[in-house]
């Protein structure tokens, strides 16, 4: 599973479970970690570990928890007012452009460039030239002369909504 | 591909109110996360509220919690943001961010696919 919410993941809460607490909505809002009911009478708190509400809203639900891939690891897991963050493994990285999955970083630089920048779980290896010192945009290295990286660093959230 | 355009706004007094608008062309936008951030002169782009989608609920920072209503016409792939008891501090560019997906509303820059080129409000007596 990935990071996004269809509308089937919202399913509705049972509303009347004796351990949802209930609060009162300010200026027709519910606090974080909350939802409005639907008479919009009450907050209901998200259930811990399950669903979460990050901003004052009228969500009728609250959004539920994201679980990390096979291939991620769970750097904090999900409370009532913040979502799973999850990262990816060491040696994969995750684009902004492809949020979907973890891709492998490159082993090494194609021939005539050299590495300034490691694998890191939101980066691929960084390459440039050796005599300009532009960036190299190629996706599959050279085999022969590779340069080869270290393993990724810690540690930056992968979850995309913050 | 997604093009925002925004729209309504201005210079206003303290207290005032504006509506301000997003209109969105290229595809539509029915089944994505839509929002606004601002950037205030100096300071860095902020979340300001925003919807998961059509009828499904909505997000609000806490500093324009209840001054300012998010909305939404899918129909006519526009999102609006009426802002009401304007103050000093709520001056800034206003930038339309939509998210490819329903995912859960785009509070944070990254979670944004596409960025209007943004409306200024000025508050000031």
């Known amino acids: 599973e990935s990071a996004l919410i269809t509308q089937q993941d919202l399913a509705p809460q049972q509303r009347a479970a004796p351990q949802q607490k209930r609060s009162s909505p300010s200026e027709g809002l519910c606090p974080p970690g909350h939802h409005i009911s639907e008479d919009g009478r009450d907050c209901i708190s998200c259930k811990y570990g399950q669903d979460y509400s990050t901003h004052w809203n009228d969500l009728l639900f609250c959004l539920r928890c994201t679980r990390c891939d096979s291939g991620e690891v769970e750097l904090s897991p999900c409370t009532t007012t913040r979502n799973t963050v999850c990262q990816c493994e060491e040696g994969t990285f995750r684009e902004e452009d492809s949020p979907e999955m973890c891709r492998k970083c490159r082993t090494g630089c194609p021939r005539g460039m050299v590495k300034v920048g490691d694998c890191t779980p939101w980066s691929d290896i960084e390459c440039v030239h050796k005599e300009s010192g532009t960036k190299h945009s190629g996706e599959v290295p050279a085999v022969e002369e590779t340069v080869t990286s270290s393993p990724g660093t810690p540690a930056s959230p992968c979850s995309l909504s913050g | 591909e997604v093009q925002l355009l925004e729209s309504g706004g201005g210079e206003v007094q303290p207290g005032g109110s504006l509506r301000l608008s997003c209109a969105a062309s290229?595809?539509?936008?029915?089944?994505?996360?839509m929002g606004w951030f601002r950037q205030a002169p100096g300071k860095e782009r902020e979340f300001v509220s925003a919807?998961?989608?059509?009828?499904?609920?909505?997000y609000y920072a806490e500093s324009v919690k209840g001054r300012f209503t998010i909305s939404r016409d899918d129909a006519k792939s526009t999102l609006y943001l009426q802002m009401s008891s304007l103050r000093a501090e709520d001056t800034a560019v206003y930038y339309c961010?939509?998210?490819?997906?329903?995912?859960?509303?785009?509070?944070?820059?990254?979670?944004?696919?596409?960025w209007g080129q943004g409306t200024l409000v000025t508050v000031k007596p």
């Open positions: 961010v939509v998210a490819r997906t329903p995912e859960t509303p785009i509070t944070s820059a990254r979670g944004a696919n596409y």
């Open positions: 919807s998961v989608w059509n009828n499904g609920g909505n």
């Open positions: 290229g595809r539509s936008i029915s089944n994505y996360a």
